[in-house]
């Protein structure tokens, strides 16, 4: 046959669906790797072909449209399945060809199991929301395009594997649930079920998500460096090991890189030509506050270095701050015998 | 093909105990939830309860949370509902009936239980 | 508990009528009502979920309508083998609960 762009096996679309329930697939191609869509495809002449491959299988194969109830079918560039069944898992080609072109994409297809806590292999998504910030919503995702806006499904929520009903501070509202103020105790998976009819049939979604609760922009503040600090002095001999913790708060804040660093005389570490080593370690807060210990280090430490600047600097989106650590050389103590017993008058 | 066939009719003696049960095939166990409803002759549908097979969770009607306990075994994918301290007015079809997203689709065929002295 | 008032109890009526049977929640229940059809010696069917939504198989001349407290079957044209009862119950809150049936009788 002939050449045909191959992008391959996109895993980074490494699609999850539920068994028994409808899955809407759109073709890559035009998501991904083409510079026009669907329609303007269609209208150009070409044709989207679809083809698999079953799990633990080498043998591509057409898709059978021709299922009872129509289970799978094309419609423009979406493939659908309704429902599916564990055994679709394997990997989906969409091809997109006329007698002159044709392009070609591959992604991996999962059908997954859950039990009745709704675990399962899927990964899910994590939606964070700010701890006693007010009423905040998170909605029943990846539900748009499996019916019509006329078309009233119903929505069930839960917690884990509770039905959310009584409950103090979250309140089903349909595709929404409106958590009244966010607590830690508010961590953890949630699910919606929706149901909704279709030609005669009634089918499942089951969609859950992480909920995170995190710090609130109302207490954020700039970055906080605990260590290096007034309170501390570095005093080393020559020879001796220099280790220089800096430790920073960050508050949560979302979308924020923090970041810390340490200079030496005004430069970068990497540009001086000290033999200097930094270790990093950060730990979170139940609300997603972050510390971060970079711990600087000089295995034999000499006088000049000793006489040398050394600031730790932290940035977040909330701002910028710097703290120089106070390093001296140790002043020798007074030798004993010699000293102390001149101190004495001894000859 | 999605069946929940229940133990046969059963006749008991005020203050005993009875043991329903409701096995499950066509499908997996433990992705469903199983309730209890029952109706006395005559009368309207009575929810008792629900079993979570995956947690072993199970919530009550508190008209009868002294008395009921709604268990489920995984490895025969099977329901149990027993209702202990029997009086005449137990006597009812008892139902099993599997739920997802509130929806009661499947339903047993029925457990007749007789109180009689 | 939310009580859930059916009526009639029983009614009478022929092929081909069109026959409305109410519910009445004793508190807002949203949409989470279910019909179900249940026949003499027989387990309960699921019609409709959700106050107004035919499950699987259901033929389209049962329909249901309503919220929060009101809540309305209605078979449009009745048939030989829609004689039966239909229970209404609410699928909000523990416990759920369930109207007293309606009887549907061939006058």
């Known amino acids: 046959s002939e050449r045909c762009d191959d992008w391959g096996l996109d895993t980074m679309r490494q699609i999850q669906v539920f068994e028994d329930e409808p899955a809407r697939i759109k073709c890559p191609l035009f998501e991904h790797f083409l510079k026009f869509n669907y329609s303007t495809a269609h209208s150009a002449g070409l044709t989207l072909i679809w083809y698999w491959t079953r799990q633990d299988r080498d043998l591509e194969e057409p898709i059978n449209f021709r299922l009872p109830e129509n289970r799978i079918s094309k419609e423009k560039d979406v493939l659908w399945f309704r429902p599916t069944l564990l055994n679709d898992t394997g990997n989906y080609t969409c091809m997109l060809r006329n007698t002159t072109y044709c392009s070609k994409v591959a992604f991996p297809l999962e059908v997954v199991q859950k039990d009745s806590c709704f675990n399962s292999p899927m990964k899910l998504p994590v939606h964070k929301l700010y701890i006693e910030y007010g009423i905040q919503r998170i909605t029943c995702p990846n539900v748009d395009g499996y019916f019509p806006s006329s078309v009233k499904p119903t929505i069930t929520w839960y917690m884990g594997c509770y039905k959310i009903q009584n409950f103090n501070n979250v309140i089903p509202e349909g595709m929404n649930l409106s958590f009244l103020i966010a607590l830690i105790s508010n961590n953890g998976n949630y699910t919606c079920v929706v149901t909704y009819p279709e030609n005669g049939r009634t089918f499942h979604l089951t969609r859950t998500l992480t909920v995170k609760v995190v710090g609130s922009p109302k207490n954020a503040v700039p970055p906080v460096i605990h260590s290096p600090n007034d309170h501390v002095v570095y005093e080393k001999e020559p020879g001796e090991e220099l280790l220089i913790p800096c430790t920073v708060y960050f508050s949560f804040l979302m979308d924020s890189r923090n970041e810390v660093w340490w200079t030496i005389d005004g430069k970068k570490p990497d540009d001086i030509t000290i033999d200097v080593t930094i270790n990093e370690s950060i730990s979170h807060s139940r609300t997603e506050d972050e510390t971060r210990t970079q711990i600087l280090s000089i295995k034999k430490v000499t006088s000049e270095d000793l006489k040398r600047s050394y600031v730790c600097h932290a940035r977040s989106a909330k701002g910028e701050v710097a703290k120089a650590a106070k390093v001296k050389q140790k002043v020798p103590a007074p030798r004993y015998t010699v000293e102390l017993a001149c101190g004495f008058g001894a000859t | 093909e999605v069946q929940l066939v229940q133990s046969g009719a059963e006749v008991k003696k005020p203050g005993s105990s009875v043991k329903v049960s409701c096995k499950a095939s066509?499908?997996?166990?433990?992705?469903?939830?199983i309730h209890w409803v029952r109706q006395a002759p005559g009368q309207g549908l009575e929810w008792m309860g629900y079993n979570n097979p995956t947690s072993g969770y199970s919530e009550y009607n508190q008209k009868f949370t002294d008395r009921v306990t709604i268990t489920a075994d995984k490895s025969t994918s099977t329901a149990y509902m027993e209702l202990s301290s029997l009086r005449s007015e137990d006597t009812a079809v008892y139902y099993c009936?599997?739920?997802?997203?509130?929806?009661?689709?499947?339903w047993g065929q029925g457990t007749l239980v007789t109180v009689s002295s | 508990a939310i009580q859930m008032t059916q009526s009639p109890s029983s009614l009478s009526a022929s092929v081909g009528d069109r026959v409305t049977i109410t519910c009445k929640a004793s508190e807002n229940v949203g949409y989470s009502v279910s019909w179900f059809q249940q026949k003499p010696g027989k387990s309960p069917k699921l019609l409709i979920y959700?106050?107004?939504n035919r499950y699987t198989g259901v033929p389209s001349r049962f329909s249901g309508s309503g919220s929060a407290t009101d809540f309305t079957l209605t078979i449009s044209s009745l048939q030989p083998e829609d004689f039966a009862t239909y229970h209404c119950?609410?699928?909000?809150?523990?416990?759920?609960?369930f109207g007293g049936g309606t009887k549907v009788e061939i006058k």
């Open positions: 119950g609410q699928i909000y809150i523990y416990p759920y609960t």
């Open positions: 959700g106050a107004s």
């Open positions: 066509g499908y997996t166990f433990n992705s469903y939830w």
């Open positions: 009936a599997r739920e997802y997203g509130d929806l009661f689709a499947y």
